[in-house]
Interface confidence: low
């Protein structure tokens, strides 16, 4: 003689967070008469998920109409699944009794695993800017994913990076997990337009990884090179001296002209020209009245770039010499910020 069996045909069910989990349970017989209850876990500490007979279970709906006498399908749907719902669910048949119903038979259980998508990766760079040739660290964080298996990759301008360390927490079992990775990136002068990308791949993303980006323009400081040049005479007794400020980033830059150590003029770079690599160029000029000087004049172009210590370049103007164009000096390198062309 056949006895009622409680069949939970799905050994495991995998559901994405936010979706609905369907837990199948079928009784092979209509007798004995009595309700079905669903529990998460087994033993005395099990949690009641659904009781056919009584109670309010707002997240649970039944697949079929349990009010029908001939119903054998006791499958349920649990809505808006979160990682906290993971566990093994048991469908339990009770036999009608007095005063209480008596547990008759349990299904083998269905393990509900919740797939939760990782949050969008957030990439953070260093607090302070750094100059080319220096190594800076970027961090990438993503949270709330399940299962634990996840892949994280770093790229700079499409090229995969290898110098990084990644941790997934917690180490043990959890309803959801977080990932934290730190990558080291060596800056170059051409990195103003560069991007660092953190890419996270997870089973929930169906082959379409999430990406977080950081622009190196927020991280890099390219110091300017200076060149002071004496231009041809503009008029009798006047010499035009220019200071070329080249290849700097960011734009924040202040330039001061000194004549024999005395401040002649200070200006802030505003109208600048941009190079293809994202750095800026700026030129400032100073018109020197030679007749006002008896002795030779030391002209100094002093640049303060992005709050860094000033760098300078000097040019000696010989007042006794015939005002012909003099050669340019070698550029001095320094850190820089803003710039403008002033004519």
């Amino acid at each position: 003689e056949e006895e009622l069996q409680v069949i939970q045909p799905d050994k495991s069910v995998l559901v994405a967070a936010g979706e609905t989990a369907t837990l199948r349970c079928t009784a092979t017989s209509l007798i004995p008469v009595g309700p079905i209850q669903w529990f998460r876990g087994a033993g005395p500490g099990r949690e009641l998920i659904y009781n056919q007979k009584e109670g309010h279970f707002p997240r649970v709906t039944t697949v079929s109409d349990l009010t029908k006498r001939n119903n054998m399908d006791f499958s349920i749907r649990i809505g808006n699944i979160t990682p906290a719902d993971a566990g093994t669910y048991y469908c339990v048949k009770f036999r009608k009794g007095s005063p209480d119903d008596v547990e008759f038979k349990s299904g083998a259980g269905t393990e509900l695993s919740v797939r939760a998508k990782p949050s969008a990766p957030v990439v953070s760079g260093p607090a302070a800017r750094a100059t080319p040739q220096h190594t800076v660290s970027f961090t990438c964080e993503s949270h709330g994913f399940s299962p634990r298996d996840i892949t994280l990759k770093w790229f700079k301008n499409g090229n995969e990076l290898s110098d990084f360390q990644t941790n997934v927490d917690p180490v043990g079992e959890s309803v959801s997990y977080s990932i934290h990775s730190t990558a080291k990136v060596v800056l170059t002068r051409e990195d103003v337009h560069s991007q660092v990308i953190c890419e996270v791949a997870h089973v929930t993303l169906q082959g379409d990884p999430l990406r977080g980006t950081a622009n190196l323009s927020e991280t890099i400081r390219v110091p300017p090179t200076l060149e002071v040049t004496q231009q041809p005479v503009r008029a009798e007794n006047q010499v035009n001296v220019t200071c070329q400020v080249r290849k700097f980033y960011p734009q924040r830059l202040q330039l001061t002209w000194l004549e024999n150590g005395n401040v002649s003029r200070t200006e802030t770079a505003s109208t600048v020209t941009e190079n293809k690599d994202g750095t800026y160029n700026w030129m400032s000029w100073l018109l020197v009245n030679v007749s006002a000087h008896r002795d030779d004049v030391k002209l100094t172009c002093q640049v303060e770039h992005d709050g860094q210590p000033a760098v300078s370049k000097s040019h000696d103007l010989k007042v006794s010499a015939h005002p012909k164009e003099q050669g340019s000096n070698t550029a001095a390198e320094n850190t820089g910020s803003n710039e403008r062309n002033i004519y």
């Epitope: 045909p9 799905d10 495991s12 995998l14 079928t26 083998a108």
Partner: antibody
Framework: QVQLVESGGGVVQPGRSLRLSCAAS????????MHWVRQAPGKGLEWVAV????????IYADSVKGRFTISRDNSKNTLYLQMNSLRAEDTAVYYC???????????????WGQGTMVTVSS | DIQMTQSPSSLSASVGDRVTITCQAS??????LNWYQQKPGKAPKLLIY???NLETGVPSRFSGSGSGTDFTFTISSLQPEDIATYYC?????????FGGGTKVEIK
Amino acid sequence: QVQLVESGGGVVQPGRSLRLSCAASGFTFSSYGMHWVRQAPGKGLEWVAVIAYDGSNKIYADSVKGRFTISRDNSKNTLYLQMNSLRAEDTAVYYCATTDTKYTLGFAFDIWGQGTMVTVSS
Amino acid sequence: DIQMTQSPSSLSASVGDRVTITCQASQDISNYLNWYQQKPGKAPKLLIYDASNLETGVPSRFSGSGSGTDFTFTISSLQPEDIATYYCQQFTYLPPTFGGGTKVEIK
């Protein structure tokens, strides 16, 4: 490659017995419920029986209940259908089938064998 | 058992035609309905699951819709390789039951 291969079909006289086998490969056999579905010549499809992943639960169509027994040997990745007291109306191609876990319920048959023909005739 | 009534039992259409097959369940089966294609001498092949979801690798000209008791299977543009018999199948209740099939031929 996921594969189900049936064997054991043939011609048998009414009242006699026959045992069908279904060899599974390419997937974790022990994690899936397994089914037998049949198709009489020129007719439609009829579900016959299901067995739970661990063999503890078995359900049969009314038309075969008491005559057919479904079983499995997970160590051999093999499903069986023992057919006793065969009748002429049992003549059909017998397919074993299973489902992919992506289906919430266990009765969407996305993996089928090629079928084995059972002819019950005197 | 849930009775699945499929219609028509056969149809003939031209290449490129839109073909529609209906399946009616004897009671509400939610959206737990599959559609299969079976070519002569071959095992059935799952095309649509859960009433409207296209099985991986199945051409997008096949589609399904419906919920409750009434379901529709559509081939948007019939191709010569679509000559086959198509079956609906419910799996809300045991036993799972199939429709009688629709044989699709080319004019």
